[in-house]
């Protein structure tokens, strides 16, 4: 009998949203308020994450899944599962330890987050500059100078694509 019990753990029958209550003869009890179990067979429920202060609730906690947080306006998420909120800056700025700072000449940032980056040096990739860079935009590189024959019609290029926007996956 004991061998059968050890092979067939009664706790394995407890579904997500419950826990195996040792105090009640290993009965499956529902997770108490503000707690959850996302998998079956758990002996405890995990405390729900609370989205406080600069964090706001993106998804409420349920008996089977944790709450999910994002950031209040003016801040953006960092880290796995939005573990931190970081202050936004304007495009053309970067966040330093002293706050938001304008990008220096020759650098750009087209996001509200991240660093000011040097403009791409088109010539290093054998190309020429089609559109000059600004504080908010990288240069746009085009064909190499040799590819631009005299008298070729000049076409206005499309606006540069946005830099990577690191939205949580």
């Amino acid at each position: 009998f004991e061998r059968t019990r050890s092979l067939q753990d009664p706790c394995s029958n407890c579904p997500a949203g419950t826990f195996c209550d040792n105090n009640r003869n290993q009965i499956c009890s529902p997770c108490p308020p503000n707690s959850f179990s996302s998998a079956g067979g758990q002996r405890t429920c995990d405390i729900c994450r609370q989205c406080k202060g600069v964090f706001r609730t993106r998804k409420e906690c349920s008996s089977t899944s944790n709450a999910e947080c994002d950031c209040t306006p003016g801040f953006h998420c960092l880290g796995a599962g939005c573990s931190m909120c970081e202050q936004d800056c304007k495009q053309g700025q970067e966040l330093t330890k002293k706050g938001c700072k304008d990008c220096c000449f020759g650098t750009f940032n087209d996001q509200k987050r991240g660093i000011c980056r040097p403009w791409t040096n088109c010539s290093l990739d054998g190309k020429s500059v089609l559109v000059n860079g600004t504080k908010e935009r990288d240069v746009v590189c085009g064909p190499s100078p040799a590819d631009l024959s005299p008298g070729a019609s000049s076409v206005t290029p499309p606006a540069p694509a946005r830099e990577p926007g690191h939205s949580p996956q």
């Epitope: 330093t96 220096c104 987050r113 040097p118 590189c141 830099e163 996956q169």
Partner: antibody, heavy 120, light 106 residues
Framework: QMQLVQSGAEVKKPGASVKVSCKAS????????MHWVRQAPGQGLEWMGW????????NYAQKFQGRVTITRDTSASTAYMELSSLRSEDTAVYYC?????????????WGQGTLVTVSS | SYELTQPPSVSVAPGKTARITCGGN??????VHWYQQKPGQAPVLVIY???DRPSGIPERFSGSNSGNTATLTISRVEAGDEADYYC?????????FGGGTQLTVL
């Protein structure tokens, strides 16, 4: 599961070029800059440059300017690093690494590395 | 160009605290990141933005940064912590790594 899988080891002669690939999976490839870092045997880490997978914009370490070209193929979620005019001092393990989020530019995920041996 | 200076090696007994320094001019104004690299493996980010830990990195790893020195602290050191450790910063146009510190667990 996020992964950066690099191409296999290469043996090259001095003066030749090598092109190493880095295939990304498990995340939005276009959403994160990709960097290349190398490490010579018994030495430290040396940054080579980055590519913006969305626009193709690049930035190279001064030491490698004129010899390195970093490109990407967004449809294949793959970044490439080509190094030309190889010399014996270029023998190293070459890593691709994904840039993290926010300020300060950290490299939060690395490929397994590709050994490039330059020998006559 | 910006330079980061690390001690080549640090030794520590198991269970004790290891401190690895990274020196640079006014480094306290920059965000410092730390990587652990074990032999034959790729580097792994263990601390970012001076003192934040990626998920999966034990709480024993912590960081600080002020003035001209950033420090990686590993408390209750284990044999598995034996590795090379690199600090890294972004400096206006390039990514800069320290020379690396080999941590030996005695």
């Amino acid at each position: 599961q996020m992964q950066l899988v690099q191409s296999g080891a290469e043996v090259k002669k001095p003066g030749a070029s090598v092109k190493v690939s880095c295939k990304a999976s498990g995340y939005n490839f276009a959403g994160y800059y990709m960097h290349w870092v190398r490490q010579a045997p018994g030495q430290g880490l040396e940054w080579m440059g980055w590519v913006n997978p969305q626009s193709g914009g690049t930035n190279y370490a001064q030491k490698f300017q004129g010899r390195v070209t970093i490109t990407r193929d967004t449809s294949a979620s793959t970044a490439y690093m080509e190094l030309s005019s190889l010399r014996s001092e270029d023998t190293a393990v070459y890593y691709c690494a994904r840039e993290g989020e926010g300020r300060g530019l950290d490299l939060d995920w690395w490929g397994q590395g590709t050994l490039v041996t330059v020998s006559s | 160009s910006y330079e980061l200076t690390q001690p080549p090696s640090v030794s520590v007994a198991p269970g004790k605290t290891a401190r690895i320094t990274c020196g640079g001019n006014n480094i306290g104004s920059k965000s410092v990141h730390w990587y652990q690299q074990k032999p034959g493996q790729a580097p792994v980010l263990v601390i970012y933005y001076d003192s934040d830990r990626p998920s999966g990195i034990p709480e024993r790893f912590s960081g600080s940064n002020s003035g001209n020195t950033a420090t990686l602290t590993i408390s209750r050191v284990e044999a598995g912590d034996e590795a090379d450790y690199y600090c890294q910063v972004w400096d206006s146009s390039s990514v800069v790594f320290g020379g690396g510190t080999q941590l030996t667990v005695l």
